[in-house]
Interface confidence: medium
């Protein structure tokens, strides 16, 4: 059986939309499937790699690599999207390419960044972990770390940094899929909202879905002990 909830929820474009949340109900009138997984049910994607989920994560990563920061022209906010999802008339799509990206490093200007921009994250403005010396962030945003400390300044002069961020990674469903969404949408969908991250590649949704002890390697499920828990 399914339980359907419909509600007006604030979406990425800053407008309220009618959204449906479909929850698979437990046939035996008990905890939901997500709760059962958290409690240690034998859910194979938490025990070993699931090809389907792996493909989904890789697909999401490929899309994210090509994303940019969509900044609303009315200064209402910005969100990480694909170019096709960013209005050409109402917004500015900040995407580095050819010669528009900043240099990879201050000491060598020949190498320009082509991956990015990312809303509210920039290697030039992050102090921890700083992109410098031996630890220069790669030219692939899906390999960027979470910036835990931004340089203290109200304005950077960069469009993708001086905007109000409207969406962050949200882990939705037992498949561990990730979307950049508003907090409202994420909570309505019973997802896990990552306030600390800017990109889906920075979070490990399956790890969150499975709960219990975190995976040793966030990308590799290893909860074999589930076989004895349930």
């Amino acid at each position: 059986a399914q339980h359907v909830t419909t509600q007006l929820v604030l979406r990425n474009k800053g407008v309220y939309e009618s959204v449906k949340y479909i929850q698979q109900e437990n046939f035996w009138i008990g905890p939901s499937s997500i709760d059962l997984i958290h409690l240690g049910a034998k859910f194979s994607p938490c025990i070993r790699k699931d090809q389907q989920i792996e493909q989904l994560v890789l697909r999401e990563r490929d899309l994210e690599r090509d994303s940019g920061c969509c900044v609303q022209n009315d200064h209402s906010g910005c969100i990480q999207t694909q170019r096709k999802d960013c209005s050409e008339t109402l917004a500015t799509f900040v995407k580095w390419q050819d010669d528009t990206g900043p240099p990879m490093d201050k000491s060598d200007l020949g190498q320009k960044r082509t991956s990015g921009a990312v809303c509210h994250q920039d290697p030039r403005t992050c102090e921890e972990p700083a992109s410098s010396g031996a630890h220069i962030w790669p030219d692939d945003i899906t390999k960027w770390p979470i910036c835990t400390e931004q340089a203290k300044s109200n304005r950077t002069g960069f469009l993708h940094m001086d905007c109000q961020i409207k969406g962050r990674p949200c882990c939705i469903s037992t498949k561990g899929s990730c979307e950049i969404t508003t907090r409202e949408y994420c909570e309505f969908m019973h997802g896990y909202f990552h306030e600390e991250a800017t990109l889906c590649s920075q979070v490990h949704c399956l790890d969150k879905v499975c709960g219990l002890l975190p995976f040793l390697n966030p990308e590799v499920p290893d909860q074999f002990y589930r076989l004895w828990l349930s």
Partner: antibody
């Protein structure tokens, strides 16, 4: 309006440490993408880049002089400092500071100070 | 380090004349080159950056161009205040390096 002004001891003796100050206005080193560099010019010779400090405190030095150079900044006072240890006659020169800008494009050394003359003599 | 070979080392020219100075980079600098003017009193002013972009307030008679690893500064019609020393500067890589300079004298 961006201005930079260098100051130094004028004269000092061999083996001493040269301390130079660059005081600037019209910009702040707490602003992303800005930096200040030091350059010198010995009499009748060309220009030689010495060191650079960026808004995020990242520092670069001329490898040929690195062991003797120390660059630092006081963001609140709008000042950048350069120390050159163990000076000798070859360090006699006019020392300039200049602003640099690092962003999408890179506008190197766009504003220069007037220079300060330093003589190393016993 | 990147070597910048500047020529000529000195140049005598008359008012109204067109002159051209050249810098050659020993390695690829991708257009990260500026031209500086140093007046007899020691003051230094940047004229051009990114090989050909004129700084604001610089007269249009100055122009910069690039051909491969050769970078040129041209002054279309010399005026009295143009007689000075000129240096090229590469800023593609640290350490920044300068050309040896061209002394432009009045004939």
């Amino acid at each position: 309006q961006v201005t930079l002004k260098e100051s130094g001891p004028g004269i000092l003796q061999p083996s001493q440490t040269l301390s130079l100050t660059c005081s600037f206005s019209g910009f702040s080193l707490s602003t992303f993408s800005l930096g200040v560099g030091w350059i010198r010019q010995s009499s009748g010779k060309g220009l030689e880049w010495l060191a650079h400090i960026w808004w995020d405190d990242e520092k670069y030095y001329n490898p040929a002089l690195k062991s003797r150079l120390t660059i630092s900044k006081d963001t609140s006072k709008n000042q950048v400092f350069l120390k050159i240890a163990n000076v000798d006659a070859a360090d006699t020169a006019t020392y300039y500071c200049a602003r640099a800008y690092y962003s999408k494009s890179y506008y190197a050394l766009d504003y220069w100070g007037q220079g300060t003359s330093v003589t190393v003599s016993s | 380090d990147i070597q910048m070979t500047q020529s000529p080392s000195s140049l005598s020219a008359s008012l109204g004349e067109r002159v051209s100075l050249t810098c050659r980079a020993s390695q690829e600098i991708s257009g990260y080159l500026s031209w500086l003017q140093q007046k007899p009193d020691g003051t230094i002013k940047r004229l051009i950056y990114a090989a050909s972009t004129l700084d604001s307030g610089v007269p249009k008679r100055f122009s910069g161009s690039r051909s491969g690893s050769d970078y040129s500064l041209a002054i279309s019609s010399l005026e009295s205040e143009d007689f000075a020393d000129y240096y090229c500067l590469q800023y593609a890589n640290f350490p920044f390096t300068f050309g040896s300079g061209t002394k432009l004298e009045i004939k």
